[in-house]
Amino acid sequence: APTSSSTKKTQLQLEHLLLDLQMILNGINNYKNPKLTRMLTFKFYMPKKATELRHLQCLEEELKPLEEVLNLAQSKSFHLRDTKDLISNINVIVLELKGSETTLMCEYADETATIVEFLNRWITFCQSIISTLT
């Protein structure tokens, strides 16, 4: 059974992940983002089901395309810098949260999503899990 300290650690990691995802979302919605139109054309895969920490496998697999889409906006006029480091941090948190013992094959929904829908979906996931822990 999870101890109160492990639950607290999980909660803090989820809060960190939540903040990182919200930071990306705020960054791409920035009116100075010259590549937003282009970014919105990219289709991301969404999880068929995302109710448990192990389902973060579906987020992990889409982090590489997310990094490359965000890479488009690396310019002086756009404040979301160091995409590589940000995605790397998210990756570390995701790996810790989902655990490496089970390599679940991710099941994706048939419908794809824009970067905004994709980020909102995972933000909602974090908020939902956090609420069950508190």
Partner: antibody, heavy 118, light 107 residues
Framework: QVQLVQSGAEVKKPGASVKVSCKAS????????INWVRQATGQGLEWMGW????????GYAQKFQGRVTMTRNTSISTAYMELSSLRSEDTAVYYC???????????WGQGTLVTVSS | DIQMTQSPSSLSASVGDRVTITCRAS??????LGWYQQKPGKAPQRLIY???SLPSGVPSRFSGSGSGTEFTLTISSLQPEDFATYYC?????????FGQGTKLEIR
Amino acid sequence: QVQLVQSGAEVKKPGASVKVSCKASGYTFTTYDINWVRQATGQGLEWMGWMNPNSGNTGYAQKFQGRVTMTRNTSISTAYMELSSLRSEDTAVYYCARGRQWLGFDYWGQGTLVTVSS
Amino acid sequence: DIQMTQSPSSLSASVGDRVTITCRASQGIGDDLGWYQQKPGKAPQRLIYSASSLPSGVPSRFSGSGSGTEFTLTISSLQPEDFATYYCLQHNSYPRSFGQGTKLEIR
């Protein structure tokens, strides 16, 4: 880590067919298209066609229409490219490469040499 | 079908030089262009996607620019490992098409 591993070299007679495989690992096979590109010795890269492993949809370059077939087996994350009615001009290294929308071809197989000789 | 014309077809340069390779599309392709490097006996490697974006792991001396029909790949300061053949690829529409390649040789 992402890997595309292709089958070994083949020697075929003119008129025969060849089937090259491309086994994907390190990612969900159905989330990226598989493209096939060939290169004759000392020549440039030539795009042959693509396949969406999720739907099985394909698209071929006009030059290969009717001679090429691209298929997949999702249970073993493997794509196949079969080229029929082989002629000497088909002697080349055949590559598979994964692609997704405008990200281009980010990972490539190691290449499979197909030699067509009588 | 879209034709991609690359120039020059070959180029001699020295370590430390700044080098530019051009690719021209027969019709507008927006930003849908990638650049690839190929060394003898090896598979090509992606250098640039979406005309100007650098994938992680690619040295920053490589840069891409352009949109529509005119594109360039620039290597700001040639390194010994950069001597190879470079190809552009349009991924705007099917059939995909490559430029004929630019062989970069040591002067």
